[in-house]
């Protein structure tokens, strides 16, 4: 089949990094500078992506693969193949359509991207707040209020030691 195909279409013999040049009797010509072909049998080479402005080059273009971009510091990638660069915010903020805004009271964001999320509601798990939340950090839940009542120890007693050679029941 391969031999039949190559008899029918001489372009199928052109490897990645070349194109089938109709102007030169379908000879396989190397891709010109700043272009590439990632598969064989191509009749044209694709123009290399240029990483300019807020985009920076993560991987240079070669004759067989396109350039890859990422974003300059202060931005992060969005979209397939880093087609967009979105600004970072500080911890304790979220990106709105009009820019970075502080998290509202009762919410936090511990990352430079994403949205502010509500603090954990400790009481839903029957626990109390051990450390208050901030714009940058969630609350830390501690033992339940009952565990902290007078006379109750907040220290968990150690598990009884097992005798050597005895498997647990």
């Amino acid at each position: 089949f391969e031999r039949t195909r190559s008899l029918q279409d001489p372009c199928s013999n052109c490897p990645a990094g070349t194109f089938c040049d109709n102007n030169r009797n379908q000879i396989c010509s190397p891709c010109p500078p700043n272009s590439f072909s990632s598969a064989g049998g191509q009749r044209t080479c694709d123009i290399c992506r240029q990483c300019k402005g807020v985009f920076r080059t993560r991987k240079e273009c070669s004759s067989t693969s396109n350039a890859e971009c990422d974003c300059t510091p202060g931005f992060h990638c969005l979209g397939a193949g880093c087609s967009m660069c979105e600004q970072d915010c500080k911890q304790g903020q979220e990106l709105t359509k009009k820019g970075c805004k502080d998290c509202c009271f009762g919410t936090f964001n511990d990352q430079k991207r994403g949205i502010c999320r509500p603090w954990t509601n400790c009481s839903l798990d029957g626990k109390s707040v051990l450390v208050n939340g901030t714009k940058e950090r969630d609350v830390v839940c501690g033992p339940s209020p009952a565990d902290l009542s007078p006379g109750a120890s907040s220290v968990t007693p150690p598990a009884p030691a097992r005798e050597p050679g005895h498997s647990p029941q």
């Epitope: 979220e94 990106l95 709105t96 359509k97 009009k98 805004k101 949205i115």
Partner: nanobody, 124 residues
Framework: EVQLLESGGGLVQPGGSLRLSCAAS????????MSWFRQPPETGLKWVSS????????YYADSVKGRFTISRDNSKNTLYLQMNSLRAEDTAVYYC?????????????????WGQGTTVTVSS
């Protein structure tokens, strides 16, 4: 598969006009707010405009207010951006975006699908 396909970009002289379109497929278009964002060559992605699901409420960035108009045709599953009095600083790749459940105004940022973009160049 959810898809957004922009068209209508091109080269235009300062003061000129362009109309961008965004054809949506793979979801119930009339249920969702939609937005336009743009990525200028030298800076990060910027929000341009949003429209609610029905088309009744529209929102604009200060930099385009009075010059750009967002609209939608729910019967054609298409979003539009009419851009008038274009300036050099409007040069960018323009992206159509589907909003999630919270992105109905000019503050919440809740994009869950992006288009592939269309390039607008404003130059004399």
């Amino acid at each position: 598969e959810v898809q957004l396909l922009e068209s209508g970009g091109g080269l235009v002289q300062p003061g000129g006009s362009l109309r961008l379109s965004c054809a949506a497929s793979g979801f119930t278009f009339s249920n969702y707010a939609m937005s336009w964002f743009r990525q200028p060559p030298e800076t990060g992605l910027k929000w341009v405009s949003s429209i609610d699901a029905s088309g009744g409420d529209t929102y604009y960035a200060d930099s385009v207010k009075g010059r750009f108009t967002i609209s939608r045709d729910n019967s054609k599953n298409t979003l539009y951006l009419q851009m008038n009095s274009l300036r050099a600083e409007d040069t960018a790749v323009y992206y159509c975006a589907k909003e999630g459940s919270h992105g109905t105004d000019d503050s919440h940022y809740d994009v869950d699908v992006w288009g592939q973009g269309t390039t607008v160049t404003v130059s004399s």
